[in-house]
């Protein structure tokens, strides 16, 4: 089974090396999740041609997947540590329902999908410890998430393949933006 960062023997500090700082641990954790996403994307792209043709096959995408915007304070121009951290945590919490959706979407990478989901939960906990303004973080409504999950799972095979591709692509972009922002904190 895939191991989370910190469980791997290579992560155990050598006698004279410095233990990982909180920021380094978060950085490593995000890179671990990104590796998992790459593996899942590989399976998705091998299974269908969604990866090449998704743009021209869709008129509209109403999935409301979290996305970084200028106002979120995570970009170099207008960078704001507190606002950005709230956006990252809120975005990850919003992605959780989509990561739950991914759980039964993979054959050969089933464990990898579970690892991405679990390590995202751990990442949220790491970041919540770092955040000063926890009151500003809105948690998605469980009932809304449940009905969204039902709706996504009721789609036909083609739409489910497309949904899977879009979730993985958006999650990758969100994590890459988060990683860049967190390195400035």
């Amino acid at each position: 089974a895939p191991v989370l960062p910190g469980e791997d023997s290579k992560d155990v500090a050598a006698p004279h090396s410095q233990p990982l700082t909180s920021s380094e641990r978060i950085d490593k954790h995000i890179r671990y999740i990104l590796d998992g996403i790459s593996a899942l994307r590989k399976e998705t792209c091998n299974r269908s041609n969604m990866c090449e043709s998704s743009k021209e096959a869709l008129a509209e995408n109403n999935l409301n997947l979290p996305k970084m915007a200028e106002k979120d304070g995570c970009f170099q121009s207008g960078f704001n540590e507190d606002t950005c951290l709230v956006k990252i945590i809120t975005g990850l919490l919003e992605f959780e329902v989509y990561l739950e959706y991914l759980q039964n979407r993979f054959e050969s990478s089933e464990e990898q999908a579970r690892a991405v989901q679990m390590s995202t939960k751990v990442l949220i906990q790491f970041l919540q410890k770092k955040a000063k303004n926890l009151d500003a973080i809105t948690t998605p409504e469980p009932t809304t998430n449940a009905s969204l999950l039902t709706k996504l799972q009721a789609q036909n095979q083609w739409l489910q393949d497309m949904t899977t591709h879009l979730i993985l692509r958006s999650f990758k972009e969100f994590l890459q933006s988060s990683l860049r922002a967190l390195r400035q904190m």
Partner: nanobody, 124 residues
Framework: DVQLVESGGGVVQPGGSLRLSCAAS????????MAWFRQAPGKEREFVAV????????YYADSVKGRFTISRDNAKNTVYLQMNSLRPEDTALYYC?????????????????WGQGTLVTVSS
Amino acid sequence: DVQLVESGGGVVQPGGSLRLSCAASGRTFSNYAMAWFRQAPGKEREFVAVISYAGGRTYYADSVKGRFTISRDNAKNTVYLQMNSLRPEDTALYYCAAVDSPLIATHPRGYDYWGQGTLVTVSS
């Protein structure tokens, strides 16, 4: 399930107009994105136009932009395709399709429900 029945096809001269209708029955019509596709003999089924759930947004294939207009009347559970400036290459069997999904596709595999089709022939 959703049942779709198209009507309004026929023979028309180049430059003429036709209005296709698609009547839906079954589930809550306003939840569905509704589309028109067409299939000419020996060719693949191709996207023509789609209208979003509430009817706020419409999308068209480049080949029909400016000539065809898709609209819907949720009170009547009907979607329309107004076709103007018809050309011989518009000759095809026109199908109505529906889907309830956050994704609105331009690919036929993105739709769950289909009508039987109505034939449009553009000829002088």
